[in-house]
Amino acid sequence: MRTEAQVPALQPPEPGLEGAMGHRTLVLPWVLLTLCVTAGTPEVWVQVRMEATELSSFTIRCGFLGSGSISLVTVSWGGPNGAGGTTLAVLHPERGIRQWAPARQARWETQSSISLILEGSGASSPCANTTFCCKFASFPEGSWEACGSLPPSSDPGLSAPPTPAPILRADLAGILGVSGVLLFGCVYLLHLLRRHKHRPAPRLQPSRTSPQAPRARAWAPSQASQAALHVPYATINTSCRPATLDTAHPHGGPSWWASLPTHAAHRPQGPAAWASTPIPARGSFVSVENGLYAQAGERPPHTGPGLTLFPDPRGPRAMEGPLGVR
């Protein structure tokens, strides 16, 4: 769940010297304190696991450890979003969810985490070196991405611990601006606090938390999230070899390493217009409501504001045409 510090409610100022101006100077520090507390560097964690119940099924879980508002989540197979891999799912908090084979079920787990069940049967099952990447577009933090893969162990039910992304790219130039404002706000807050140091503290409602509580809450989204932040990265070096992917696993391997039956009739849908155009690697923040973003190197379909989640009846061909001109 997205964590935001709760601002303790203040008693209205007593009539007299402070007046309306005094009320403003008392509320402002708490607002600024909230901003300072929740303005940590966001991170994304990714967890990939093979299900014990269905050996050909994989679950990808991703979470965003930030306080901003998530506007889009993209799950990619093979590499970073927009790097020419396969988009498995796109989740929009308002417009809904789109997913493409072999993704079976994508859903929001909380306001800031998602899960995706990947149906892998034999040849479509990823090996331990296949990476899955989750990209979260949020405001005001920008665009943050992390990747994960199956753990080296082929034991079903085991999973790699959530992989944090210590070095993440903020795609928004404006982030520096936001950080600057917050920094200034924090300094200003200290200044205000010093000014009020010798004055009696405002009476807080007894039912509310103490001023220290927001800090603890803001930096501890959940136990799982905290654990994710401190998991050391371990290089995954397994026996999954590209040249032998169509044959048996070199070490016997898990039972899901069988060959995939072909589905000639299978006609996967190309990503929907709003879903198929990844967030640009650079540039200023573009609202999801404004028709999204065009990714160089792809041929995205037509984009525009009033786009729906319904699959394009033309299927994958809808992705053709330079910059959306069909």
Partner: antibody
């Protein structure tokens, strides 16, 4: 055993359209996570990625050549096609097709390549 | 675009010695520990052959005397001990973003 084989016209004139075919065996583009890409190499020079196509018909192109490239596939025949419009002498190269497996973004198996010359 | 710069452009190594080839990216190709960098070997008249994927994972059939390392922007391919059959041109390639690019190549000669 995975094999890929490129075929093309060998020689063509400037402004013509180059059509190349990649015929493969040992894998299928019906399989989730499978892709085929095209890479070229001018004589005595380095490699240049052009485009690739996934089993689900997702296509990706090199930005510089995007307007001239078209990749397509014929899944039932195990073939992938590349068209390059308005060729000039700079397009003379050995063209390779290569397999991408398990959704991964690297080229696992390569064809032997087909040499394309552009002459006036 | 990410530019990959290989060095040296060529090197001559005595049989049994170590060959070290560097590939430097103009921007990081690593995300949360995964480096989207690959190495290929190309012998005259042959297509490239995958040596390493994700920077350090040895591809099938590649001898253990080859090793790959690095993350972020700096990557290295080492061959030790070098054998006669290792004479070839070695290329690095990234897939961090589109377009994928290759390094200019390093020609390895055996003395």
């Amino acid at each position: 055993q995975v094999t890929l084989k490129e075929s093309g016209p060998g020689i063509l004139q400037p402004s013509q359209t180059l059509s190349l075919t990649c015929s493969f065996s040992g894998f299928s583009l019906n399989t989730s996570g499978t892709g085929v890409g095209w890479i070229r190499q001018p004589s005595g020079k380095g490699l240049e990625w052009l485009t690739h196509i996934w089993w689900n018909d997702n296509k990706f192109y090199n930005t510089f050549l995007k307007s001239r490239l078209t990749i397509s596939k014929e899944t039932s025949n195990n073939q992938v096609f590349l068209k390059i419009a308005s060729v000039d002498t700079a397009d003379a190269a050995t063209y390779y097709c290569a397999r991408m497996a398990y959704g991964n973004l690297w080229f696992v198996n390569w064809g032997q390549g087909t040499l394309v010359a552009v002459s006036t | 675009d990410i530019v990959l710069t290989q060095s040296p452009a060529s090197l001559a190594v005595s049989l049994g010695q170590r060959a070290s080839i560097s590939c430097r990216a103009s921007r990081s190709v690593t995300i949360s520990g995964y480096s989207y960098m690959y190495w290929y070997q190309q012998k005259p008249g042959q297509p490239p052959r995958l040596l390493f994927y994700l920077a350090s994972n040895l591809a099938s059939g590649v001898p253990a005397r080859f090793s790959g390392s690095g993350s972020g922007t700096d990557f290295t391919l080492n061959i030790h001990p070098v054998e006669e059959e290792d004479a070839a041109i070695y290329y690095c390639q990234h897939s961090r973003e589109l377009p994928y690019t290759f390094g200019g190549g390093t020609k390895l000669e055996i003395k």
